[in-house]
Interface confidence: medium
């Protein structure tokens, strides 16, 4: 039959070449002379000339050694033709399978692999995977089957078998407990890949295993006892820096300290923060301490980490004895701001109030008083008693010194300590209104026509407060009522001035008396310019010389 079974040829053959592989034979050779040829890659197309055929005998020839890793299988076609060139058989498929030899070593994909694992993990924890390749066949032979192993471990602490490698997958795992970053932060493993499933050629690489920090070390106070001295009343005062040591990785959450005042701070006087660089606990006063109330505080401070502990660890506690130092404290006015109602215009020398201060210090210190700020100079203060008296006329209507009926005075108290200290108080005098101002009209100059004159409306103002203001009453005096009339409107806050008889063009004085609701009377002279005109006017028309 015109058929050839698949031909197996080992790679890297020693020859001699050409080497006879198999004979092509057509049974048509009984009838006629047959000529054989082959075509296909490896014969007449690239890679050309690997195979040939003896034209007349049909022997298939191999011309050179084969490389399975280059081409593992050749597919050729055999042809048989008669002398005249006519095909006597259909083209026959010839399969040549190149069989593998172990001619390649395994090759790691990297010279150095890096991985990491948390310290303290349990045996069996996977760390990383390494990979080696082998170009040889791993399907039909063991030539390309790679087995992994760990050759050595550096350093060999706590012992030399901390890791294992899966012989087939290359997965490196922890095999022993005791990974401790604080002792060994990095291991260097020399790893091997061996073909023939561990019985062949070997190649080597390095796997660097970084041991990651876990919070397996508690911060410890060093020292554990502190004594500090703090002046009383100081707020934000640094009392003490507490120092801790932590074997975990510096500047990591497992190292950074968190401080907590566990006891001794009943009044919430203290606070503790962590210094971002030194990791120290900075104990400061949140409120001022009072020597007279309590001259010593014993604080208990606990330290932990930002990160939780990965195992149960005892926490460290520090004891801080804080001695409060006495300082000469300033006298304090009681109350710090005092509101006193007083009638404006009280007689000079009349008492306004007594305003005194208390000294927080326990010694019986003498306090003396004086006025620190009295803008109008209306008051005096007795240095011994704190009695405030009027030495000037208190004027509620004085807009330069009085705002919203209040006159503000600052007073000072000084003790006789060494050195002496001072405290200030604010005295707010609410001035009660007295009807000491009469009503006044605005404007006080008018221009009016002497024919069909327009009524002049004047606004009435009174510096006093109600009820010492409207309704107002108006009255013309000194014969002004002969030519003029004055009427207050219904609301009682404006006066209407009218010319009731003809006056020649000139300037006249109108004497207007206004009184308020408390009958406080005020006489005002209105300057009236009368013009020769009709109706409304603002200035007299035409050339005119005033009289």
């Amino acid at each position: 039959d015109w058929v050839v079974a698949p031909i197996s040829v080992p790679e890297n053959g020693k020859g001699p070449f050409p080497q006879r592989l198999n004979q092509l034979k057509s049974n048509k050779d009984r009838d006629t002379k047959i000529f054989y040829s082959i075509t296909g890659p490896g014969a007449d197309s690239p890679p050309e000339g690997v195979f040939a055929v003896e034209k007349e005998t049909g022997w298939l020839l191999l011309n050179k050694p084969l490389d399975r890793e280059e081409i593992a299988k050749y597919e050729l076609f055999g042809h048989a033709v008669s002398e005249n060139g006519a095909s006597v058989e259909d083209p026959m498929n010839i399969s040549i399978i190149v069989t593998d030899q172990n001619d390649h070593k395994p090759k790691f994909t990297q010279d150095t692999f890096r991985g990491s694992v948390l310290e303290g993990v349990l045996p069996g924890t996977s760390v990383m995977q390494v990979t080696a390749t082998d170009e040889d066949d791993a399907i039909y032979t063991y030539n390309g089957v790679v087995a992994y192993s760990i050759h050595s471990q550096e350093p060999k602490d706590p012992h030399d078998l901390m890791f294992t490698i899966h012989r087939s997958t290359g997965t490196i795992s922890v095999i022993s407990s005791g990974l401790d970053r604080e002792k060994v932060p990095e291991y260097t493993l020399t790893i091997q890949a061996t073909d023939m499933d561990g019985d062949g050629s070997t190649t080597t690489a390095v796997a660097v295993v970084e041991i990651l920090d876990a919070n397996d070390n508690a911060p410890m106070f060093d020292p554990q006892k502190y004594e500090a001295h703090v002046p009383e009343n100081a707020v934000g005062h640094e009392v003490q820096r507490l120092t801790v040591t932590d074997l975990d990785a510096p500047n990591s959450p497992a190292w950074r300290a968190t401080y907590l005042i566990m006891g001794g701070d009943d009044g919430d006087h203290f606070t503790i923060t962590t210094h971002p660089e030194s990791n120290q606990g900075i104990l400061t006063t949140r409120k001022g301490l009072d020597f007279e109330a309590k001259n010593q505080h014993t604080l208990y401070v606990e330290v932990t980490n930002e990160a939780p502990f990965v195992l149960k660890l005892p926490t460290s506690t520090a004891t801080i004895v804080v001695h409060v130092e006495d300082v000469n404290e300033a006298p304090v006015f009681v109350p710090p701001s005092k509101v006193v109602e007083v009638q404006e215009g009280i007689p000079t020398g009349e008492p306004v109030c007594v305003y005194t201060a208390e000294d927080p210090d326990k010694e019986n210190q003498k306090i003396s008083y004086r006025i620190l700020r009295d803008p109008a100079g209306w008051l005096a203060m007795d240095p011994d008693s704190g009695q405030v008296t009027a030495v000037g006329t208190l004027d509620r209507e004085d807009e330069q010194f009085v705002r919203n009926n209040i006159y503000e005075v600052m007073v000072l108290a000084m003790d006789n300590g060494s050195p002496p200290t001072t405290g200030t108080g604010t005295l707010l005098l609410t001035l009660i209104d007295v009807n000491d101002h009469g009503p006044v009209p605005e404007p006080r100059q008018i221009t009016i026509c002497n024919q069909s004159p327009v009524r002049q409306v004047l606004n009435i103002t009174d510096k006093d407060l109600s009820p010492h203001t409207s309704p107002f009453q108006a009255q013309l005096t000194d014969d002004s009522d002969i030519y003029w009339t004055a009427e207050v409107n219904e609301e009682g806050d404006t006066v209407v001035l009218s010319l009731k008889k003809f006056l020649k063009q000139d300037t006249y004085d109108v004497h207007l008396s206004l009184s308020d609701h408390g009958n406080k009377e005020q006489l005002t002279v209105i300057r009236a310019t009368v013009c020769d005109c009709h109706g409304h006017v603002e200035t007299c028309p035409g050339p005119w010389k005033g009289g």
Epitope: R114, P185, V208, L247
Partner: antibody
């Protein structure tokens, strides 16, 4: 201020021993990995050994088994015990502080170096 | 061991000119987990110990003038001095800290032309 000061160098015969010291100040010795690096006369730099914060060590293959790195935290001093010395160990030996304790600090980079001490191995 | 090769071995450059020194590693120094290159550059002046200039291949150490810069990734790295100063005359070394043993380049000697 961080300072490292080496001492203990000198002339020694092949096969002899020498102990180098490195006194450090300005930081706590046990808080950083510390390296020994050497430089043969007119040549480049060669890393020799490291001691980590927890006391673990590593060595260049050329000195493994002959040199031992150690430290005394109470004295803030690093040591390099050199045994079975060879002519090729002749060099200036520097101690050098690692940038940080942790990989992310760039632990393998060395930010502070001593002035070095000369070791001459010759008969 | 990882082999570090620097080029050129020496060079002479005029003051104010740009200088580039190359460093090649026999394997990649890029760690895929953190995308960092485990490479440092040092300057060593005559009679002095080395001084750290750059770590992580491109991070300038504090106090180092900004005319010094590092670049590169994987196996090819460069130290650049943007404008050479007289005080920059020294030998420059690259160093890998990807794995133990740490290894240095053979050094590049920089002189003033």
């Amino acid at each position: 201020e961080v300072q490292l000061l080496e001492s203990g160098g000198g002339l020694v015969q092949p096969g002899g021993s020498l102990r180098l010291s490195c006194a450090v100040s300005g930081f706590t010795l046990s808080s950083y990995p510390i390296n020994w690096v050497r430089q043969a006369p007119g040549k480049g730099l060669e890393w020799v050994s490291v001691i980590w914060t927890g006391g673990g060590t590593n060595y260049a293959s050329s000195v493994k088994g002959r040199f031992t790195i150690s430290r005394d935290n109470s004295k803030n001093t690093l040591y390099l015990q050199m045994n079975s010395l060879r002519a090729e160990d002749t060099a200036v030996y520097y101690c050098a502080k690692s940038r940080g304790v942790y990989d992310f600090d760039g632990r393998g980079a060395m930010d502070y170096w001593g002035q070095g001490t000369l070791v001459t191995v010759s008969s | 061991d990882i082999v570090m090769t620097q080029s050129p071995d020496s060079l002479a450059v005029s003051v104010g000119e740009r200088v580039t020194i190359n460093c090649k590693s026999s394997q990649s120094l890029l760690y895929s987990s953190n995308q960092k290159n485990y490479l440092a550059w040092y300057q060593q002046k005559p009679g002095q110990p080395p001084k750290l200039l750059i770590y992580w291949a491109s991070t300038r150490e504090s106090g180092v003038p900004d005319r010094f810069s590092g670049s590169g990734s994987g196996t090819d790295f460069t130290l650049t001095i943007s404008s050479l100063q007289a005080e920059d005359v020294a030998v420059y070394y690259c160093q890998q800290y990807y794995s133990y043993p740490y290894t240095f380049g053979q050094g590049t000697k920089l002189e003033i032309k």
